[in-house]
């Protein structure tokens, strides 16, 4: 007689390991005999997917290699046409041994910031974290936390929480430790011991002491009067993360020294900085081998004309050169209003560079005179008239005073560029700039009284200032 | 044209002494710096002294106080004075204008020191 | 005192070849106020003196071939020979301007094939 399916056997919660293998049973008593259908979380498991075998008549559902993903409802559903169908479930719990998805890596971090050691698990039962640093289970303390997802976040990082870090997950099913990583602590440089500031005689050695220390271990570099050190010997020594440097210097001259501690977190850098002074005593004696000394422009008037952070010449010749060589060039500067618009400029330029000489680095301290060729331009080119009412002047003893002839060259007493393109000071302002031709002045010029060569042409821009010469 | 020639070089015994001169033309000699450089036989070059348009002489630590720059503005000559010869001061000797760069050199004298 | 290291110690090459001479200072040789470099390259050939094809670096003296260029600041410098030519068989010198005394470097000698 024809009977509806009944299930004799209904599904059970099975628990299954990753690639184990997972039955299903599904005993159905009927006639005629049942189609059985099989459905994970109600979606239809095809028969012909091969990760499954189905047998007997479909009573027997296998998952032959569990993943973590088979995790859900499974149900089996009889029909034979006599009656309704019916319908068992039951659930498949993917047991997991733990599995470190996301391991924690090497982090560099800056002593006072947050650390965060990524640890991300898998597993079933869900795993507990717990981290190793050294050969040692991690404490936990106000700084250092483990956070529910197994990461370890440190507070306020200090140098002692440098070290080895691994984290461990553990279930009821077994262990998973994470590779070794290293936590370095970086720590911006700091000064530890300042250069202190001198009073020396002229021609004494001076040796300034500078100490720093940081997580690199910080360079130290010195600086003089805004520029690199250019002379003196610099001895460094490093012990425990501490930078020793001494810098002996052969003082001819005033200066600000800076000890420049700098280390690398990254692409940035940390910097401290700390300075001395170091005075000449009886520094108005004369010294023959000593006629100035070099620093930095600290002037006005010639601010517009001179390079930014010119290293000028400043000679000792007068009591207070800064204030004497200013006093100069405003007195002059002054006179100059009155000129033609194609002579100031060409003036001041010629003035402030006469004043203020650039400093020259090789033997200390040395001014370098403005070059022949730009001091004629100047007197036969941009302001010959000028020039000529000026020496008229002179030549008739109208000027009261001697000061404003310290401030104009004699163009014939500088070196000229062709014979030592080092040996003097170019005028920038002077230079003919081929991208803007207005700049070029007028030809108002005879041949110079002095005789000067001509000069062959350049790579650089050039500016024929007369036929018998020119400005590279 | 700037003409720099060297003379005075010879034979000179250890511990001796040597007086080189550099007669300039062509340039207004009292404006610039002047050099002396040294070549040994199949040796590089050798920066051995300078002096400013002030007559401020500097030396190579190896000829410090054993040589001696001078200039005669008027004459338009640059010497060099050796003195305590050594035969590792053999060598060509150069005289140089230049002030950061050695612009132009002589032909150079040979100097050398043997017994 | 500023020690001046060339490398290589020689280079042989074709005519039309590239050369390439770099000079490594002990120190800065760069002036931080201008940010001009105290660096010179000097050519000298078999028996004759040596003359200066580069100064500040960079600047080609003048009557100096354009195959002749210089490059670089601080410590690390270049001389590049463009297109070398049989009369470039010479040994080549860096020399530092910077800081009394003076320093060359030991020399680049350059031979054509």
């Known amino acids: 007689l024809p009977k509806a399916p009944v299930i004799t056997t209904p599904l059970e919660t099975v628990d299954a390991l990753v690639e184990e293998v997972a039955t299903f049973m599904c005993a159905v008593e009927s006639y005629p005999q049942p189609e059985i259908s099989w459905t994970r979380n109600k979606i239809l498991i095809k028969l012909f997917d091969t990760r499954y075998s189905i047998r007997e008549n479909g009573q027997l559902l296998t998952i032959l290699s569990v993943e973590d993903s088979d995790d859900g409802i499974y149900c089996c559903t009889a029909n034979n046409g006599v009656g309704g169908a019916v319908e068992s479930c039951g659930a498949l719990q993917v047991k997991m041994k733990p599995k470190i998805t996301r391991p924690p890596i090497n982090v560099k971090i800056i002593e006072g910031l947050k650390a965060v050691l990524p640890c991300t698990t898998m597993g079933n039962p869900k795993p507990s974290v717990s981290w190793i640093k050294g050969d040692s289970p991690l404490r936990e303390n106000s700084r250092t936390a483990v956070l529910e997802s197994g990461s370890l976040r440190i507070h306020n990082v200090q140098k002692e929480d440098a070290g080895q870090y691994r984290c461990v997950a553990k279930n009821s099913l077994g262990t998973a430790y994470s590779k070794v990583v290293k936590l370095e602590v970086e720590v911006f440089a700091r000064i530890l011991r300042a250069p202190e500031s001198h009073n020396v005689t002229f021609g004494s050695f001076v040796t300034l002491h500078c100490t720093a220390t940081g997580i690199p271990v910080p360079t130290i570099t010195w600086i003089e009067n805004g520029n690199a050190v250019s002379s003196g010997s610099i001895q460094e020594s490093v012990k425990d993360r501490v930078i020793d440097s001494r810098l002996q210097l052969f003082i001819t001259k005033p200066g600000l020294y800076t000890c420049i501690a700098t280390n690398k977190h990254g692409e940035k850098f940390s910097t401290a900085k700390a300075a001395a002074t170091v005075s000449i005593a009886e520094w108005s004696k004369p010294q023959k081998d000593n006629k100035g000394y070099c620093a930095q422009y600290r002037g006005e008037v010639c601010n517009a004309v001179l390079a930014k952070d010119a290293l000028v010449f400043l000679n000792t010749s007068y009591a207070d050169p800064e204030e004497a060589q200013e006093l100069l060039v405003h007195t002059a500067w002054n006179e100059l209003k009155v000129v033609s618009p194609l002579c100031r400029p060409a003036a001041e330029a010629l003035l402030c560079n006469h004043v203020f000489q650039e400093c020259s680095p090789g033997v200390v301290p040395t001014p370098i005179p403005i070059c022949r060729e730009y001091c004629l331009a100047v007197k036969e080119l941009f302001c010959a008239k000028e020039w000529l009412a000026m020496e008229e002047k002179t030549h008739r003893g109208l000027y009261r005073s001697e000061m404003h002839l310290l401030s104009v060259p004699e163009c014939s007493k500088l070196p000229s560029m062709h014979w030592d393109p080092t040996a003097c000071a170019r005028l920038p302002h002077l230079d003919y700039n081929k991208e803007n031709p207005k700049t070029f002045p007028p030809m108002t010029s005879s041949k110079p009284s002095v005789d000067i060569p001509n000069l062959p042409s350049s790579s650089s821009s050039s500016f024929s200032v007369s036929p018998t010469y020119s400005m590279t | 044209e700037v003409q720099l020639v060297e003379s005075g070089g010879g034979l000179v015994q250890p511990g001796g002494s040597l007086s080189l001169s550099c007669v300039a033309s062509g340039f207004t000699f009292s404006l610039y710096y002047m050099n002396w450089v040294r070549q040994a036989p199949g040796k590089g070059l050798e920066w051995l002294s300078v002096i400013d348009t002030h007559s401020i002489a500097y030396y190579a630590d190896s000829v410090k106080g054993r040589f001696t720059i001078s200039r005669d503005n008027v004459k338009n000559t640059l010497y060099l004075q050796l003195n305590n010869l050594k035969p590792e001061d053999t060598a060509l000797y150069y005289c140089?204008?230049?002030?950061?760069?050695?612009?132009?050199w002589g032909q150079g004298t040979q100097v050398t020191v043997s017994s | 005192e500023i020690v001046l290291t060339q490398s290589p110690n020689s280079v042989t090459a074709s005519v039309g070849e590239k050369v390439t001479i770099n000079c490594k200072s002990s120190?800065?040789?760069?002036?931080?106020?201008?940010?001009?470099?105290?660096l010179n390259w000097y050519q000298q050939r078999p028996g004759q003196s040596p003359r200066l094809l580069i100064y500040?670096?960079?600047t080609q003296q003048s009557g100096i071939p354009d195959r002749f260029s210089g490059s670089g600041s601080a410590t690390d410098f270049t001389l590049t020979i463009n297109s070398v030519q049989p009369e470039d068989a010479a040994v080549y010198y860096c020399?530092?301007?910077?800081?009394?005394?003076?320093?060359f470097g030991q020399g680049t000698k350059v031979e054509l094939k």
């Open positions: 140089v204008l230049g002030r950061t760069a050695l612009v132009r």
């Open positions: 120190q800065r040789v760069q002036l931080g106020s201008n940010q001009k470099s105290y």
């Open positions: 500040y670096a960079s």
């Open positions: 020399q530092q301007g910077y800081s009394a005394p003076f320093t």
